[in-house]
């Protein structure tokens, strides 16, 4: 009956953690004698190829300083402690502690048997590191050129994390990769870049980080912050201003970042009706008269700049009873 070595084609272990490389000789055959078990790294330099051996009488040996006896152990193999007990070598599973990047590679588990001869199996050990993720907005001031408005950082992953962005905005991502402080790891930074405008301010975009150490992708929301000058509109005009009306008000509606620092009401004619009183963002009209047949201008300033809106007013002699007209500027 033929025997075979059962190993996993690939084993993944966490950087700094412990991993087991399973290796079993199957099936159990009466009279099949396992004389030696060895673990080798065929791709390593010659003086580091022999990783471990288990001799039925002498037990385990770990000749190479890397990984060495401090970090290696046979999980189940047992030597014959007395002459009347047989060694148990069918399970040659090897445990490797304190995983380093240098541990990554092919490992061959080999059973020297009689009478079948030598049989072996190979496992690829992959050393992975779970990255730490972080995303943040980068406050920018509006401009005509694309600039990074958010960044997402996946620190010290192995292999490098994959970063993408979820957003309805018109954007592009710029990615950089640098070596992590832990040897063999990579820190990935993705910058969410767009032409910054008020439309992007306060919008939430999502950084999506994928890594094989995650059960599912990490989703990190980021609220953008764009400093832009006031975007102004005027509301309150209902196309039914008539002589003597007393309940009229104009509002200066503003979107800006940061908040406005000042509002200024004026007219294009340069004549400002005395019955119109500016109260910050509102213009309160005590009584409409013929001087209101003009264009009102609201000018708003903030730390970034200035914005203005105009509203043309038409003063009727009598109320318009045909129904309310359109409002807004």
């Amino acid at each position: 009956q033929d025997v075979r070595v059962q190993v996993l084609p690939e084993v993944r272990g966490q950087l700094g953690g412990t991993v087991e490389l399973p290796c079993h000789l199957l099936p159990p055959v009466p009279g099949l004698y396992i004389s030696l078990v060895t673990w080798q790294r065929p791709d390593a330099p010659p003086d580091h190829q022999n990783v471990a051996a288990f001799h039925p009488k002498m037990g385990p040996s770990f000749p190479s300083p890397k990984p060495g006896s401090q970090r290696l152990s046979f999980v189940s193999a047992k030597q014959s402690t007395r002459q009347d007990t047989e060694a148990e070598l069918q399970d040659a599973t090897l445990a490797l502690r304190g995983l380093t990047v240098e541990d990554e590679g092919n490992y061959t588990c080999e059973f020297a048997t009689f009478p079948k001869g030598s049989v072996r199996g190979m496992t690829w050990l992959r050393v992975i590191a779970k990255p730490q993720n972080h995303a943040e907005a980068q406050e920018v001031t509006f401009s005509q050129d694309p600039v990074p408005v958010a960044r997402c950082i996946s620190k010290e992953g192995r292999p490098p994390a994959r970063i993408s962005w979820l957003s309805s905005l018109d954007w592009e991502a710029k990615e950089t990769q640098v070596s992590g402080t832990l040897a063999g790891t990579v820190t990935v930074t993705s910058r969410f870049t767009l032409v910054p405008s008020g439309r992007a301010d306060g919008v939430t975009v999502t950084c999506k980080v994928e890594h094989e150490s995650f059960e599912e992708p990490a989703l990190i929301p980021v609220t953008l912050s764009v400093r832009y000058p006031p975007e102004v509109s005027i509301s309150g005009y209902d196309d039914n201003w008539y002589l003597g009306r007393t309940d009229a008000t104009l509002s200066c509606d503003v979107h800006s970042n940061p908040e406005p620092t000042g509002y200024d009401w004026s007219t294009t004619s340069g004549i400002f009706p005395t019955s119109a009183v500016a109260q910050g963002s509102q213009l309160v009209i005590h009584a409409v008269d013929s001087l209101f047949n003009t264009t009102f201008v609201c000018t708003v300033t903030n730390a970034v700049g200035m914005g203005r809106a105009e509203q043309v007013i038409f003063v009727r002699e009598t109320p318009n009873t045909a129904g309310a007209g359109a409002t807004g500027g």
């Epitope: 009279g31 004698y33 004389s35 047989e86 020297a112």
Partner: antibody, heavy 116, light 107 residues
Framework: EVQLQQSGTVLTRPGASVKMSCKAS????????IHWVKQRPGQGLEWIGA????????NYNQKFKAKAKLTAVTSTSTAYMELSSLTSEDSAVYYC?????????WGQGTTLTVSS | DIVMTQSQKFMSSSIGDRVSVTCKAS??????VVWYQQRAGQSPKTLIY???YRYSGVPDRFTGSGSGTDFTLTISNVQSEDLAEYFC?????????FGSGTKLEIK
């Protein structure tokens, strides 16, 4: 302590047969193969074959298949090798040995001289 | 069968010298090689197994190296008790085969 005690020196004629013994002690006889190795002066070592006392299974080097017969008697923990149709080429020291990782335990050897 | 060739039948060394005994396999045997020492009138004793692993109680002046087809037993700081014959053996494939031996003589 593991011991393999072999039978003494044999002097015999060409064409004859001889049966030599290897008595084992100090371990479970039925659990390990007993191997036989031939050594001629200046000719190195040759593996003849092995017998597994647990089920009397045997395994031979093809070169010695017609020459040697390996058996074991569990009741006396003794392995035997019978050599037939002897010629001067068979004159050698024959060792029984126990495989524990390597051939870790050896008998003292049986010297066979075939001469007319 | 796999042929294990020890090309040097004899080697001569002085006490304290370093000497290397070589063994070549006719085909790849991995690291499945043992080195034995046989003193005159005695049975062989294991020195090295799996090409480079030193057997229990063997002085560390004995080291084994090699894999595949080329193997070396190195004795550094040769002592008078090292006067013996040295054999390599492969256990990769049935039948097991031995080298023809290298006799170390002390000047």
């Amino acid at each position: 302590e593991v011991q393999l005690q072999q039978s003494g020196t044999v002097l015999t004629r060409p064409g004859a047969s001889v049966k030599m013994s290897c008595k084992a002690s100090g371990y479970i006889f039925t659990s390990y193969w007993i191997h036989w190795v031939k050594q001629r002066p200046g000719q190195g070592l040759e593996w003849i074959g092995a017998v597994y006392p647990g089920n009397s299974d045997s395994n031979y080097n093809q070169k010695f298949k017609a020459k040697a017969k390996l058996t074991a008697v569990t009741s006396t923990s003794t392995a035997y090798m019978e050599l037939s149709s002897l010629t001067s080429e068979d004159s050698a020291v024959y060792y029984c040995t126990k495989l524990v990782g390597t051939f870790d335990y050896w008998g003292q050897g049986t010297t066979l001289t075939v001469s007319s | 069968d796999i042929v294990m060739t020890q090309s040097q039948k004899f080697m001569s060394s002085s006490i304290g010298d370093r000497v290397s005994v070589t063994c070549k396999a006719s085909q790849n045997v991995g690291i499945n090689v043992v080195w034995y020492q046989q003193r005159a009138g005695q049975s062989p004793k294991t020195l090295i197994y799996s090409a480079s692993y030193r057997y229990s109680g063997v002085p560390d002046r004995f080291t084994g190296s090699g894999s595949g087809t080329d193997f070396t037993l190195t004795i550094s700081n040769v002592q008078s008790e090292d006067l013996a014959e040295y054999f390599c053996q492969q256990y990769n494939t049935n039948p097991f085969t031995f080298g023809s031996g290298t006799k170390l003589e002390i000047k």
